[in-house]
């Protein structure tokens, strides 16, 4: 359990840099994370909205806080979900 946990952790931390990348090859991963964010009401992988770098402006609606019942914070003048997605992803992987 702890070994697989460590592998998942390392993989997610490693892939954080893909969110701020601008190449075509990273787009598929970014789009998958965007869908995940909208479903689980979270933002980014490790550092929240900052993980997206300059892409934060590129994707409309990114991390947009649509649910007032969830913790939100201001980032670049916009309300975004406060919780990062890492714990949600780990839970999701564990269940599936």
């Amino acid at each position: 359990k702890s070994k697989s946990d460590r592998i998942v952790n390392e993989t997610l931390y490693e892939n954080t840099k893909l969110l701020s990348a601008t190449g075509e090859s990273e787009k598929q991963f970014q789009e998958a994370i965007i869908v995940f964010q909208e479903e689980f009401k979270c933002c980014g992988l490790v550092n929240g909205a900052a993980d997206w770098g300059n892409n934060f402006q590129h994707y409309p609606e990114l991390c947009a806080c649509l649910d007032k019942q969830r913790p939100c914070q201001s980032y670049n003048g916009k309300q975004v979900y406060k919780e990062t997605c890492i714990s949600f992803i780990k839970d999701f992987l564990a269940k599936n």
């Epitope: 909208e38 409309p60 609606e61 947009a64 806080c65 003048g77 916009k78 309300q79």
Partner: antibody, heavy 116, light 109 residues
């Protein structure tokens, strides 16, 4: 080319029901949140409802809460709006739009008339 | 009564510059990005400006948007007859957990 095509509008009596559909093409439907926006004759735009890409989250405007239900079938690339207990004030052109807070593509709309 | 306030009408002559304002509060414009839509007579609305000042591809650079505090504005320079339309501002309202539009501004050229 992104296309959104609404259908299901028509004349219905107060208290009646109607189900609107929106057929989407030209993009990966399951990657996007979707919304319904309406416009009463000669009036401005009014947001109705939104749904997340995987249907996990739905959002409604206060005037339609408890009466309207938004849903989607990603295998059919189709968005739905089930409208119950319809009132005269629900009379409008109903537009289907891509995304939930930046509506980047719109359908041409379908007219719903609630009248006795 | 719309949550966002826009002037009902605006006008200008060809070549002129016109500005349309959109006023809100801390729970909508003050904390979320503003979007502008153009609705030509008898047609569906079209995205004009998103994230306060970004133009989608295909929208001429004559259209520009800005936001300051709880207000936003749309500027149209080099006005043309085909710009005659209704213009709506919109944003998410964090208090309502819903999307809100301005009442719309009818632009006459």
């Amino acid at each position: 080319e992104v296309q959104l095509l609404e259908s299901g509008g028509g004349l219905v009596q107060p208290g009646g029901s109607l189900r609107l559909s929106c057929a989407a093409s030209g993009f990966t439907f399951s990657n996007y949140a979707m919304s319904w926006v309406r416009q009463a004759p000669g009036k401005g735009l009014e947001w109705v409802s939104a749904i997340s890409p995987g249907s996990g989250n739905t959002y409604y405007a206060d005037p339609v809460k408890g009466r309207f239900t938004i849903s989607r079938d990603n295998s059919k690339n189709t968005l739905y709006l089930q409208m119950n207990s319809l009132r005269a004030e629900d009379t409008a052109v109903y537009y289907c739009a891509r995304r939930s807070s930046v509506f980047d593509y719109w359908g041409q709309g379908t007219l719903v008339t609630v009248s006795s | 009564q719309s949550v966002l306030t826009q002037p009902p009408s605006a006008s200008g002559t060809p070549g002129q510059r016109v500005t349309i304002s959109c006023s809100g509060s801390s729970s909508n414009i003050g904390s979320n990005d503003v979007t502008w839509y153009q609705q030509l007579p008898g047609t569906a609305p079209k995205l004009l400006i998103y994230s306060n000042s970004h133009r989608p591809s295909g929208v001429p650079d004559r259209f520009s948007g800005s936001k300051s505090g709880t207000s936003a504005s749309l500027a149209i320079s080099g006005l043309r007859s085909e710009d005659e339309a209704d213009y709506y501002c919109g944003t998410w309202d964090s208090s309502l957990s819903g999307y809100v539009f301005g009442g719309g501004t009818k632009l006459t050229v």
